[in-house]
């Protein structure tokens, strides 16, 4: 009896449901009373689920498995595994017995995406060329173990003096911490890439370190040189500080935040009082910190429309000002891949592969490549559509003539978050249907 299962491992995200496909070809006159079906763990032979004597015997595996009873008579012996855990990873064998018997094993590969890395710098103040700094890159709750890569602003790998540690929790999910020690040049960007080898998911973060410059103006007003990056819907702090002289009191302070280009008032503090928000009631100062010279502005529930430059004006006796840029971002969803036509595909057929990723900002960069990593640039059409909130949906369409077999990958890159979202489809030489039917 021929039992068919997928050759490639089934990849399932932790917490989702997975279908382990298994099928047989029933002969004419076949009835379920003749069927004995057993799913078991290949290595330990532990029973997972069974069907015998015309009845589903139920789950023997933490009550998280189910068959497809309506499809059994057509030869579909697939198993549904619910709420996948790391511990489920491994090989499952599907035994089918009618008169004869056959079996085949299918592999389950479990995965969980890593979070966007957090970057910390020590020391993080008064940095100058020649200083040795420690940069820590931390990414959380992924599976399997990550690969971590460091590089400089020119993309040159940084391999010396890197220590990477991975820690697993009770659920088997890993935290990864990678530490780079480096001597600062005149300026430099240091990037950390955390790769999930199963999901082909890359999570990036970087830190740019520039030598200190003295701001102009009689009152020295300091703001971050790099744009402040804020996710849509979160709160952002636009940092601004000045150095109060001895005896300074808030009665002397005039503080104005405004939009740099239009000069629209955003928030002000004058005559010893917070005059409140003039910007959709979504801004606030840090009143307890003003006397220490902290003039930072809190912007709540960031929107795409908030993106741009904000100027911080500080006047005591003299005055000074500086502008800080707000860069708004929203991550793109994992791309959805569709294939047309999607049935009975053969080498030489022309197919249209559509890669769709949703609700990101700013506009994405889309790249296609084949299974060997060679870019596919011909016959690609990419469209981006913005909604009322300014978030983009991206749809990229590739038309390609099928070879004997091939993998076609789509990478949707958020240029601000340095977030890459991948999708791929593999088309084999045999006549096939996409997505594969259970």
């Amino acid at each position: 009896l021929e039992v068919q299962v997928p050759e490639d491992p089934v990849v399932a995200l932790v917490g989702t449901d997975a279908t382990l496909c298994c099928s047989f070809s029933p002969e004419p006159g076949f009835s379920l009373a003749q069927l004995n079906l057993i799913w078991q763990l290949t290595d330990t032979k532990q029973l997972v689920h069974s069907f015998a004597e015309g009845q589903d015997q139920g789950s023997a595996y933490a009550n998280r498995t189910a068959l497809f009873p309506d499809l059994l008579a057509q030869g579909n012996a697939s198993l549904r595994l619910q709420r996948v855990r790391v511990a489920d990873e491994g090989s499952f064998t599907c035994f089918v017995s009618i008169r004869d018997f056959g079996s085949a094993a299918v592999s389950l590969q479990v995965a969980a995406p890593y979070s966007k890395p957090s970057m910390t710098l020590e020391p993080n103040k008064d940095l100058r060329p020649g200083d040795t700094v420690t940069i820590t890159c931390s990414s959380y709750q992924g599976y399997p173990e990550a690969e971590v890569f460091w590089q400089d602003g020119q993309g040159v790998p940084l391999t010396g003096n890197v220590t990477t540690s991975q820690m697993a929790n009770e659920q088997g999910l890993f935290d990864v911490h990678s530490i780079l020690r480096v001597v600062l040049g005149a300026n430099g960007t240091y990037s950390c890439l955390v790769r999930n080898p199963v999901l082909q998911q890359d999570a990036h973060s970087s830190v740019t370190i520039t030598p200190q410059r003295s701001p102009t103006g009689a009152v020295e007003v300091q703001v971050p040189e790099d744009p402040v990056v804020a996710l849509v819907g979160t709160d952002a702090t636009l940092r601004c500080s000045f150095s109060p002289e001895p005896g300074f009191s808030l009665a002397q302070l005039n503080l104005i935040w405004q939009l740099t280009d239009t000069k629209q008032l955003v928030h002000s503090f004058t005559e010893g009082r917070d005059q409140g928000s003039a910007y959709a009631n979504r801004t606030a100062l840090f009143p307890d910190l003003l006397a220490q010279g902290n003039a930072s502005l809190r912007l709540q529930r960031v929107r795409v429309a908030d993106e741009g430059s904000f100027t911080c004006f500080v006047s005591i006796r003299d005055f000074g000002s500086a502008a800080v840029s707000l860069q708004v971002a929203a991550p793109y969803s994992k791309p959805s891949m569709t294939l047309e036509p999607n049935k009975d595909l053969r080498p030489g057929d022309t197919v249209t592969i559509t890669c769709s990723s949703y609700r990101g900002y700013p506009e994405a960069e889309v790249f296609w490549q084949d299974g060997q990593g060679v870019p596919l640039t011909g016959n690609v059409t990419t469209s981006q559509m913005a909604n009322e909130q300014g978030l983009f949906d991206v749809h990229s369409v590739l038309r390609v003539v099928l070879g004997a077999n091939g993998t076609y990958s789509c990478l949707v890159r958020n240029p601000v978050l340095q977030q890459d979202a991948h999708g791929s489809v593999t088309i084999t030489g045999q006549p096939m249907t996409f997505p594969p039917e259970a």
Partner: nanobody, 117 residues
Framework: EVQLVESGGGEVQPGGSLRLSCAAS????????MSWFRQAPGKQREPVAT???????NYAESVKGRFTISRDNAKNTVYLQMNSLRAEDTAVYYC???????????WGQGTLVTVKP
């Protein structure tokens, strides 16, 4: 900006116990992954344990079964209970906070733990 202040370090004999505390400023403490790292003399800093904003915990193999990380979101504090201490646990212990969504990270100044007979 989040400020982290560690306390509870000190000298203890092998087999003894210590409880470290890390108090954080800021109103969104529950959104942070809170970690303890340590740095022994002449060695690189290494992670010891993490308490995630979702409630799960991770431990380095070398401390599993001996150390327990916990957090009190109401007090903006994370703890490290260290039992069955060994000489090789001697290090400066640092608290680290990583925001779960905007990928900003912060370090504390560290507290020294010395294990010696």
């Amino acid at each position: 900006e989040v400020q982290l202040v560690e306390s509870g370090g000190g000298e203890v004999q092998p087999g003894g116990s210590l409880r470290l505390s890390c108090a954080a400023s800021g109103s969104t403490f529950s959104m942070y992954h809170m970690s303890w790292f340590r740095q022994a003399p002449g060695k690189q800093r290494e992670p010891v344990a993490t308490s995630h904003h979702g409630g799960t915990t991770n431990y380095a193999e070398s401390v599993k079964g001996r150390f327990t990380i916990s957090r009190d979101n109401a007090k903006n504090t994370v703890y490290l209970q260290m039992n069955s201490l060994r000489a090789e646990d001697t290090a400066v212990y640092y608290c680290k906070a990583d925001h779960g969504y905007n990928a900003r990270g912060y370090w504390g100044q560290g507290t020294l733990v010395t294990v010696k007979p």
